[in-house]
Interface confidence: medium
């Protein structure tokens, strides 16, 4: 089974060392997920030329992937802790259907794909505990997710490769922005 941060013997605190704070655990957890995404991107890039495509060309897609915007309060200018935390949790919840889609998209990194999915679920739980403003967080409708998943899986091979690449790149971008913003909280 995939090892989550904190379960690996290397992560066990040494005698006399300080236990990780909640923020440090979240930070470490996000970096663990980013490591997983990196491994998945490697497999994707090795089997298709999507990684060589220009960002502008890739932008011409109809995927509605979560993205940080100025209004979300997660950037240095206009930073707002509560608004940003809601955006991070909402965004991660929206990414879950896309992470489910990735589950059958990898051969050699199948376990890694599962680890990214499971770690994201744990991260959401961590962050929900941290959030005071829980009523502002909207959870995607299960029926909407189910039909989106069906639609994505019905695409041709080229579009599925493109979708996989876009999900990984967007998720990395979202997690990086989240990581940076959470350090300010």
């Amino acid at each position: 089974a995939p090892v989550l941060p904190g379960e690996d013997s290397k992560d066990v605190a040494a005698p006399h060392s300080q236990p990780l704070t909640s923020s440090e655990r979240i930070d470490k957890h996000i970096r663990y997920i980013l490591d997983g995404i990196s491994a998945l991107r490697k497999e994707t890039c090795n089997r298709s030329n999507m990684c060589e495509s220009s960002k502008e060309a890739l932008a011409e897609n109809n995927l509605n992937l979560p993205k940080m915007a100025e209004k979300d309060g997660c950037f240095q200018s206009g930073f707002n802790e509560d608004t940003c935390l809601v955006k991070i949790i909402t965004g991660l919840l929206e990414f879950e259907v896309y992470l489910e889609y990735l589950q059958n998209r990898f051969e050699s990194s199948e376990e890694q794909a599962r680890a990214v999915q499971m770690s994201t679920k744990v991260l959401i739980q961590f962050l929900q505990k941290k959030a005071k403003n829980l009523d502002a967080i909207t959870t995607p409708e299960p029926t909407t997710n189910a039909s989106l998943l069906t639609k994505l899986q019905a695409q041709n091979q080229w579009l599925q490769d493109m979708t996989t690449h876009l999900i990984l790149r967007s998720f990395k971008e979202f997690l990086q922005s989240s990581l940076r913003a959470l350090r300010q909280m």
């Epitope: 990196s38 240095q76 200018s77 790149r169 990086q176 350090r183």
Partner: antibody, heavy 122, light 109 residues
């Protein structure tokens, strides 16, 4: 137009001190983290120190820790680097750099000053 | 301190494609940013967040990253692209910027 202008460099003896300044204009200085990056003659870039937008959080390269102090005055749109106990290996061009909006602590520099030369020699 | 490694020099024929690579463990969880520096001038950001190009940077510059390896690609290198290119990431704590040693690009012909 974003502008960063460094000053305060010069020739100083080993063990001496210098205070570098970086005057910023063309952007909301108080909203952005700032850094100092140096480049020794014929060498590559080396990150020296960073400070967050409000000035409450700072970080330093191991090579300068305990000797250099970064600070900022948001009212004056100015970044500073106080350099004490200078060593010959501190000889370099010192650049002031603005962190991009993606940079909290994982920094990226979208604008740089032209640099100020610091020479430490007896 | 994280280490980011890149080749010290690279030559490319005018109009051909140049690929500069950068490797380091930190690149798995941090973005790669690329800077161009010409003699006597300050560095200029040419690619940020692995594959994003700042406004004003020619389209021939592109970037990609996977598995702890980042690549800067210059498609159809021009004489004015000659100079030093630095890859930059963050250390494992995210507190410090880490620069590669720089790659000197020579455009032949």
């Amino acid at each position: 137009e974003v502008q960063l202008v460094e000053s305060g460099g010069g020739l100083v003896q080993p063990g001496g001190s210098l205070r570098l300044s970086c005057a910023a204009s063309g952007f909301t200085f108080s909203s952005y983290a700032m850094s100092w990056v140096r480049q020794a003659p014929g060498k590559g870039l080396e990150w020296v120190s960073a400070i967050n937008s409000g000035g409450g959080s700072t970080s330093y390269a191991d090579s300068v820790k305990g000797r250099f102090t970064i600070s900022r005055d948001n009212a004056k749109n100015t970044l500073y680097l106080q350099m004490n106990s200078l060593k010959p290996e501190d000889t370099a061009v010192y650049y002031c750099a603005k962190e991009g909006d993606t940079g909290w602590k994982d920094p990226m520099y979208d604008y740089w000053g032209q640099g100020t030369q610091v020479t430490v020699s007896s | 301190q994280s280490v980011v490694t890149q080749p010290s020099a690279l030559s490319v024929t005018l109009g051909q494609t140049a690929k500069i690579t950068c490797q380091g463990g930190g690149l798995r969880s941090s973005y790669a940013h690329w800077y161009q520096q010409k003699p006597g001038q300050a560095p200029v950001l040419v690619i940020y967040d692995d594959d994003s190009r700042p406004s004003g940077i020619p389209e021939r510059f592109s970037g990609s990253s996977s598995g702890g390896r980042a690549t800067l690609t210059i498609s159809g290198a021009q004489a004015e692209d000659e100079g030093d290119y630095y890859c930059q990431s963050a250390d494992s704590s995210g507190n410090a910027a880490v620069f590669g040693g720089g790659t000197h690009l020579t455009v032949l012909g």
